[in-house]
């Protein structure tokens, strides 16, 4: 879903734009928010659906969202629920199954109107060890040619991490991709509990810096209703 994030902060290799240099590991995937990864995920059936406690959509798989299991139920008790199919009611994009988004309270197909359509480069993305690929989408937003002469500073638009200055990676933020700092110790990072539960998200983070890995925050292990925030920690 829109809120799902790349597996283990693996923001990996992007093809170059025409005539450009290939990105190095650390480049971010790009697609318009709501244009979802269409292939590879096997949807769970009700039979094998195992409730998983959560605090945020990000903790659930691409075919799930986080909510209270009962209408008007205790907000403190939330689990990963199966995503809602087309024409079902919704409150936000994450509730809708891959290939759909929430419009006027109803899940609709994202290919009906090129949702939020600002995406001209075609992107193929390798996710961690999965080697799943993201189908290409086309993007209207182009970059100033100046980008290729000087390295992008923090917050400037980019296509891949090689466009950014040292210590920065190219990651989605709101409606485009910008150069963001590589994460330091203690900073919030993104990691999925299930291998393969990756997708596109609107606020990507860079990977953790050298000697650090993205792990669940220590003081969050005990708290049953915690957000399960992950932070960059020493190996």
């Amino acid at each position: 879903t829109l809120n799902s994030v790349l597996n283990s902060n693996a923001i990996k290799n992007l093809p170059p734009p025409l005539g450009g240099a290939a990105g190095h590991p650390g480049s971010a995937v790009s697609a318009a928010p709501g244009i979802l990864y269409p292939g590879g995920n096997k949807y769970q059936t009700i039979d094998n659906y195992q409730p998983y406690p959560c605090a945020e959509d990000e903790e659930c798989g691409t075919d799930e969202y986080c909510a209270s299991p009962t209408r008007g139920g205790d907000a403190g008790v939330q689990i990963c629920l199966a995503c809602r199919k087309r024409r079902k009611r919704c409150m936000r994009h994450a509730m809708c199954c891959p290939g759909n988004y929430c419009k006027n309270g109803i899940c609709v197909s994202s290919d009906q109107n090129n949702f939020r359509g600002e995406i001209e480069e075609t992107i193929t993305e390798s996710f961690g060890n999965d080697h799943s690929t993201l189908d290409g989408y086309s993007r209207r937003t182009t970059l100033s040619s100046k980008m290729y002469h000087s390295k992008g500073q923090e917050g400037s638009v980019c296509l891949r991490s090689s466009d950014c200055a040292t210590g920065l990676c190219c990651a989605r933020h709101f409606w485009s991709k910008i150069c963001k700092p590589v994460l330091k110790e203690g900073q919030v990072c993104t990691k999925h509990r299930r291998k393969g539960s990756h997708g596109l998200e609107i606020f990507q983070r860079c990977y953790c810096g050298e000697g650090l890995s993205c792990r669940i925050q220590k003081d969050h292990h005990q708290a049953s209703n915690s957000s399960r925030l992950h932070t960059c920690q020493r190996h």
């Epitope: 638009v157 709101f174 485009s176 606020f203």
Partner: antibody, heavy 116, light 112 residues
């Protein structure tokens, strides 16, 4: 250093129009998304609009949709906000902000007063 | 108008720690591990203090820290100083309207 200077504010009657400008310097203007954020007297911040680095994408708050138009001229390092059909509730200080990693640099603002 | 909910005012003595909360819904703050905080002194432009939940831009004191749990984000200021007296705003993203959303603001008073 990054500098953003707004101009064009003033007193205008309800239903009138005004065009705000924001002159940017100290950074590669054409590489950043830019926003307008406003603040009514004694009130909180309200996001108004954002424009992509190459002008291909624009987004607006529901409260100004259809009345305000954001634009930019990268050759002049200038951001604009064309405000039409102004209402009393549009009275505010209008800030131009660089939308890098969020609103990382702001101008000092220009006051727009809509009153008869 | 969609807005994130913040307490109108918070106060503390110099040297103390204070926390400002910012509560949203599952469609804005709760749906994303993303929130920013701004400081605004009277008559001045806002200044970015925290982004992406707990990241400080360069030049911002490490006395400022951010966190988030569920639908609520928090800004903590430790070792309170007189110059911290200002208005503080949280900011996030609202997916139904695909727009930026701010909290109503919290006035921080540093006592005596």
């Amino acid at each position: 250093q990054v500098q953003l200077v707004e101009s064009g504010g003033g007193l205008v009657q309800p239903g009138g129009s005004l065009r705000l400008s924001c002159a940017a310097s100290g950074f590669t203007f054409s590489s950043y998304w830019m926003s307008w954020v406003r603040q009514a007297p004694g009130k909180g911040l309200e996001w108004v609009s954002v424009i992509s680095s190459d002008s291909s994408s624009t987004y607006y708050a529901d409260s100004v949709k259809g009345r305000f138009t954001i634009s930019r001229d990268n050759s002049k390092n200038t951001l604009y906000l064309q405000m039409n059909s102004l209402r009393a509730e549009d009275t505010a200080v209008y800030y131009c902000a660089r939308h890098g990693i969020d609103f990382d640099h702001w101008g000092q603002g220009t006051l727009v007063t809509v009153s008869s | 108008d969609i807005a994130l909910t913040q307490p109108a005012s918070v106060s503390g003595s110099p040297g103390q720690s204070i926390t400002i909360s910012c509560t949203g819904t599952s469609s804005d703050l709760g749906g994303y591990n993303y929130v920013s905080w701004y400081q605004q002194h009277p008559g001045k432009a806002p200044k970015l203090m925290i982004y992406d939940v707990n990241n400080r831009p360069s030049g911002v004191s490490n006395r400022f820290s951010g966190s988030k749990s569920g639908n609520t984000a928090s800004l903590t200021i430790s070792g309170l100083q007189a110059e911290d007296e200002a208005d503080y705003y949280c900011q996030s993203y609202d997916s139904p309207t695909d727009s930026v959303v701010f909290g109503g603001g919290t006035k921080l008073t540093v006592l005596g």
